[in-house]
């Protein structure tokens, strides 16, 4: 039995898989900040985790995925306000009893030092200094991401 949040993640991922591949993004759009090979957009309002997930998708983006500790630190360096929390694309999968990124991969336990419990209806937020487990219904800001990728022409087999 999947939670409503897990269903939401899966639905968004499946709909993304169905869409035709867009050409790669060479530069960050206006209002987005570049961080290495990503473009980040920080919200100016607050939402629970699933609303944040949905809102990023309206911008043809996803909630932030963090590859490793190094990327976490670089992202945190962009956060100017000490006490502000931001949702990222990581929540607790009850069925798999593990932290799961919205792209379907599981958290490598060495990547993030999470403060708080790993339990049902828990989602991950970051601040300028830390990573927290929060109730997914908590209303905080969030970070969307787009990947910067070189343009690659997709080769289709002859029909």
């Amino acid at each position: 039995q999947k939670s409503s949040i897990e269903k939401c993640s899966v639905d968004i991922q499946q709909s993304r898989n169905k869409t035709t591949e867009r050409p790669g993004l060479l530069n960050c759009p206006i209002y987005w900040q570049q961080l290495r090979e990503k473009c980040l957009l920080f919200s100016h309002t607050v939402n629970p985790w699933n609303n944040s997930l949905a809102d990023c998708s309206t911008k043809e983006s996803s909630l932030l995925l963090i590859r490793d500790k190094d990327e976490l630190i670089h992202t945190q360096n962009l956060i100017r306000d000490k006490a502000i929390l931001f949702w990222i694309g990581l929540n607790f999968s009850l069925s798999e009893k593990n932290w799961k990124w919205i792209n379907g991969s599981f958290l490598n336990s060495n990547d993030l030092e999470i403060r708080g419990d790993a339990k049902e209806n828990s989602c991950i937020s970051i601040s300028q200094t830390s990573v927290y487990s929060e109730y997914c219904s908590t209303e905080i800001r969030w970070i969307c991401q787009k990947e910067l990728t070189p343009v690659r022409n997709k080769v289709y087999p002859d029909s």
Partner: antibody
Framework: QVQLVQSGAEVKKPGASVKVSCKAS????????MNWVRQAPGQGLEWMGL????????YYNQKFKDRVTMTRDTSISTAYMELSRLRSDDTAVYYC?????????????WGQGTTVTVSS | DIQLTQSPSFLSASVGDRVTITCRAS??????VVWYQQKPGKAPKLLID???IRHTGVPSRFSGSGSGTEFTLTISSLQPEDFATYYC?????????FGGGTKLEIK
Amino acid sequence: QVQLVQSGAEVKKPGASVKVSCKASGYSFTGYTMNWVRQAPGQGLEWMGLINPSSGGTYYNQKFKDRVTMTRDTSISTAYMELSRLRSDDTAVYYCARLGDNYRGYFDYWGQGTTVTVSS
Amino acid sequence: DIQLTQSPSFLSASVGDRVTITCRASQDVGTAVVWYQQKPGKAPKLLIDWASIRHTGVPSRFSGSGSGTEFTLTISSLQPEDFATYYCQQYSTYLYTFGGGTKLEIK
């Protein structure tokens, strides 16, 4: 067209509370975050906080955190700002202002303002 | 908190003049700066966002520029309806702050 219509002027005694309303029309009320900004007589503008009408989530300027409460009633597309333990320096015009974009902090439409006078 | 200092506080000018108002931030705010116009007894009206992007319906005589800590609002040819008070605002941090205002008066 977008309109934000606020409640009328109020006169309050120090220590009392005031609740100002802001009725939205001409757009989807739950689609835009509402902010509150005040302006003391002859002074500049001061941001007080925000409410997301869709979820009810709030975020307040630390200066007002212990005294302000922002709420909304989606059935009548109205946002409210209540300020308690009023002091004479709370005398100001209070504006509701719509956040123009979830990802940028500008206010594209404003209410006409509500004058709150705090006097003994 | 990020402080915004506007100069001048008062400015006298005539119809047809070109005027420039400056807004200085106490810290780097990138281009997260907004300009508003306010007339007596009225609410502020959005003119410019992101330092230089005119809001829908704002006449082209209004332009904004700058990044980092110094920003300007320029009115290329003053019209009678432009006499008002102008405010800058930053949203680089989540504690939004406003400048003290520049009152533009008829000479």
